[in-house]
Interface confidence: medium
């Protein structure tokens, strides 16, 4: 929703007010592995980037392997998704205020490039899960997310029958599938080569301008 950042005027080069984000973006030379594309300008710290690569990291005690071992080809997309969430300073146009105990802001309807969503779905559709929305309904009694009673472990394709069902449903519409392709300057890339700079800067500028806010 293009008006979701209604309470913010600073839409460019900003960090979200959430659990682990820095208050201001800046260089982070030691960002780990899949988060390294953001090292020139990041909202995450090196320790956050290191921690989020671990299974059941201390960041959120979230277990990717809640239905057996998640395929590595699938897991890398979830790590990349977490890097984008924690590190990107270019998601200001999609920040929305929320009333949650663990964060004051979230992203809503970030236009994810259609190839990034398609590839995520293709690489994950044979892994297993027990839920179609991962924000809500887990059994947290052990301190780590477990499948709730009656939620059966099935293939991702069973719970996320289409790329949109995965990218848009997984995190309660944090993403929407864009009609645009990677490199268009009109959609957010989860994956990019930082040698060419961060393509999401241009995307944020475009959508911020479309909102008539600088």
């Amino acid at each position: 929703t293009m008006c979701s950042a209604q309470d913010r005027t600073d839409l460019l080069n900003v960090c979200m007010d959430a659990k682990h984000h820095k208050t201001k973006p800046g260089p982070e030379d030691k960002l780990h592995d899949q988060c390294s594309p953001w090292k020139k300008n990041a909202c995450c710290t090196a320790s956050t980037s290191q921690e989020l690569h671990k299974d059941t990291s201390r960041l959120y005690n979230f277990n990717w392997d809640h239905c057996g071992k998640m395929e590595p080809a699938c897991k890398r997309h979830f790590i990349q998704d977490t890097c984008l969430y924690e590190c990107s300073p270019n998601l200001g146009p999609w920040i929305q205020q929320v009333n949650q105990s663990w964060r004051k802001e979230r992203f809503l309807d970030v236009p994810l490039c259609k190839e990034d969503c398609q590839r995520w779905w293709e690489d994950c559709h044979t892994s297993h899960t027990c839920k179609s929305n991962w924000h809500r309904g887990w059994d947290w009694t052990s301190g780590v997310n477990k499948c709730p009673a009656g939620a059966l472990c099935r293939t991702f394709e069973s719970y996320f029958p289409t790329p949109a069902a995965l990218c848009e449903g997984l995190w309660s519409h944090s993403y929407k599938v864009s009609n645009y392709s990677r490199g268009s300057g009109r959609c957010i890339q989860m994956w990019f080569d930082s040698a060419q700079g961060n393509p999401n800067e241009e995307v944020a500028r475009f959508y911020a301008a479309a909102m008539h806010v600088n």
């Epitope: 259609k114 179609s132 929305n133 848009e168």
Partner: antibody, heavy 118, light 107 residues
Framework: EVQLVQSGAEVKKPGASVKVSCKAS????????MHWVRQAPGQRLEWMGW????????KYSQKFQGRVTITRDTSASTAYMELSSLRSEDTAVYYC???????????WGQGTLVTVSS | MELTQDPAVSVALGQTVRITCQGD??????ANWYQQKPGQAPVLVIY???NRPSGIPDRFSGSSSGNTASLTITGAQAADEADYYC???????????FGGGTKLTVL
């Protein structure tokens, strides 16, 4: 701009079949599921089933299992719903709806009135 | 698997009204809310956690607790008079279920 345009009204005899079309435009057809929902006069919305527009997989409500068939033509960005063995209780407005996650229908067709009468 | 709604609710113009939807599937899935006016297709007003599609006024909001989801209209307008339906995904079997609908009258 996303649009779902359905075929026109139909009048059918009991026992016949009807096939309603839903042409999508303004988005990547194969990235989304398309659902079919009906509403009899003065009644609640009733979910019939869906099709994964990418691979053609379908899932139907138990109530319509065996009578409904949902298909799609990706080259025409069109979904179809065929209902067979029609009876008077099938008189309803039939809607197609795009699914943005699972049961979140953000765009709906204008509806197609199917009247079953002898 | 059912979703239960009150058949009818009324509200005075400018007042706040809450429409509820109950069902087991809501323990692990969010409800979505639709507004339907006579002779028209339903319109999505709230989806997911508490998200409004563009064009939906901010007087509409959603919330959930346990097996109950609620749609709240703060400062109801005459234009809000309509039928409101909830729906939810049923995790077992990949089905969708609708509530019976609530007819909202603005007095």
């Amino acid at each position: 701009e996303v649009q779902l345009v359905q075929s026109g009204a139909e009048v059918k005899k009991p026992g016949a079949s009807v096939k309603v079309s839903c042409k999508a435009s303004g988005y990547t057809f194969t990235s989304y599921a398309m659902h079919w929902v009906r509403q009899a006069p003065g009644q609640r919305l009733e979910w019939m089933g869906w099709i994964n527009a990418g691979n053609g997989n379908t899932k139907y409500s138990q109530k319509f299992q065996g009578r409904v068939t949902i298909t799609r033509d990706t080259s025409a960005s069109t979904a179809y719903m065929e209902l067979s063995s029609l009876r008077s209780e099938d008189t309803a407005v039939y809607y197609c709806a795009r699914d943005i996650s699972y049961g979140s229908f953000d765009y709906w067709g204008q509806g197609t009135l199917v009247t079953v009468s002898s | 698997m059912e979703l239960t709604q009150d058949p009818a609710v009324s509200v005075a113009l400018g007042q706040t009204v809450r429409i509820t939807c109950q069902g087991d599937s809501l323990r692990s899935n969010y409800a979505n809310w639709y507004q339907q006016k006579p002779g028209q297709a339903p319109v999505l007003v709230i989806y997911g956690q508490n998200n409004r599609p563009s064009g939906i006024p901010d007087r509409f909001s959603g919330s959930s607790s346990g097996n109950t989801a609620s749609l709240t209209i703060t400062g109801a307008q005459a234009a809000d008079e309509a039928d409101y339906y909830c729906d939810s995904r049923v995790s077992t079997g990949n089905h969708v279920v609708f509530g019976g609908g609530t007819k909202l009258t603005v007095l």
